[in-house]
Interface confidence: medium
Amino acid sequence: EEELQVIQPDKSVSVAAGESAILHCTVTSLIPVGPIQWFRGAGPARELIYNQKEGHFPRVTTVSESTKRENMDFSISISNITPADAGTYYCVKFRKGSPDTEFKSGAGTELSVRAKPSAPVVSGPAARATPQHTVSFTCESHGFSPRDITLKWFKNGNELSDFQTNVDPVGESVSYSIHSTAKVVLTREDVHSQVICEVAHVTLQGDPLRGTANLSETIRVPPTLEVTQQPVRAENQVNVTCQVRKFYPQRLQLTWLENGNVSRTETASTVTENKDGTYNWMSWLLVNVSAHRDDVKLTCQVEHDGQPAVSKSHDLKVSAHPKEQGSNTAAENTGSNERNIY
């Protein structure tokens, strides 16, 4: 009679995480008498997965009725597969005795587990940066298998090329992680921009996962200031406005100085929003010219988003001609932003 053979027909089996894996095993003879055991791995460190004779294996069920005397099918099903279950499984025939001794092993079936990557998480720099600066964004995704994965970066739908990606670990593992860093140059129009990290993997079957970062959380657009003198509103009164344009975020404090002395401080509240997401704001100061004997230097000083203050000044000329004072005429001087009050 021919010697018993242990046949594992599948060299490899690939299963999605969470599914059940069926590992096939048949023997060609009922002799010698003795149990079948399943192991993961070979050698002294091998792990017992199933013992036909004894033990409790809650995730393992036999495919056929292995308790029947004439049964020669010892295939098993392992439920709720995770990446940690990956490995080579051996169906081993034992000869009955005290103790049972190993008689013959199957060739082994390699179980690979397909696991989806986690949703990519994109994080930007800790501090805001201004236009023309280059900032770094990182993208991370974990827990996928097999190792082969594709990662792309986009800014507003346009693919980026300046990035570096690593998949860890380098060697064999039950699951893998990907880490990528992209460099993005900021522009003044980036308040509404998005940076997207896209991960594609065999388990996703054409539905890539995306992680997003809004550049509104990264960018700081400093304001431009313009100080102008409005037509005289009333006798001896001049209205000076400070236009604060194209700034982001909204956090802004403005201080008016008259000849270096603080006149008024206010916080931007009723701002107008531009199409590009930046803000405009206007503050005005009513100056009583008759209260000043000499020229007045008016300064609009703006502190934006905790940054060092920027300022713009305007010289208000107060003429020493009493007989003409209060005639409510404003003549423009050749100097920029200057007015002579007569």
Epitope: A16, D148, I149, T150, A200, H201, V202, L204, Q205, G206, D207, P208
Partner: nanobody, 126 residues
């Protein structure tokens, strides 16, 4: 290996409609990106439409855009190709295929698809 079966082909007049179905004998088609391809006599096989596993991503070849619609019912594990305004040049054997390995959805290269059905004949003629 996924075993795909197409149905719904036949003879139709120009301007008519047909709906092709693709099912999997092992009921696993809901796990894979799926495409419809066609091959006319003497011509190379070409991609017609493809759909991602969830159905949220679809792609079409230019000649069928606006006339053909690919969809899927994952509860029934079936993928459909609704063909309207059919033209004589749509005459071909239509194949359903599953993409088991690609990262991105692609209809252009049939080499990305590694599980095929036997095909169903579509003839557009008056």
């Amino acid at each position: 290996q996924v075993q795909l079966v197409e149905s719904g082909g036949g003879l139709v007049q120009p301007g008519g409609s047909l709906r092709l179905s693709c099912a999997d004998s092992e009921f696993r088609l809901d796990e894979y990106a799926t495409g419809w391809f066609r091959q006319a006599p003497g011509k190379e096989r070409e991609g017609v439409a493809c759909i991602s596993r969830s159905g949220s991503n679809t792609k079409y070849t230019d000649s069928v855009k606006g006339r053909f619609t690919i969809s899927r019912d994952n509860a029934k594990k079936t993928v459909y190709l609704q063909m309207n305004s059919l033209k004589p040049e749509d005459t071909a054997v239509y194949y359903c295929a599953a993409d088991l390995t690609s990262h991105y959805l692609s209809c252009s290269s049939y080499t990305d698809y590694n599980s095929w059905g036997q095909g169903t004949q579509v003839t557009v003629s008056s």
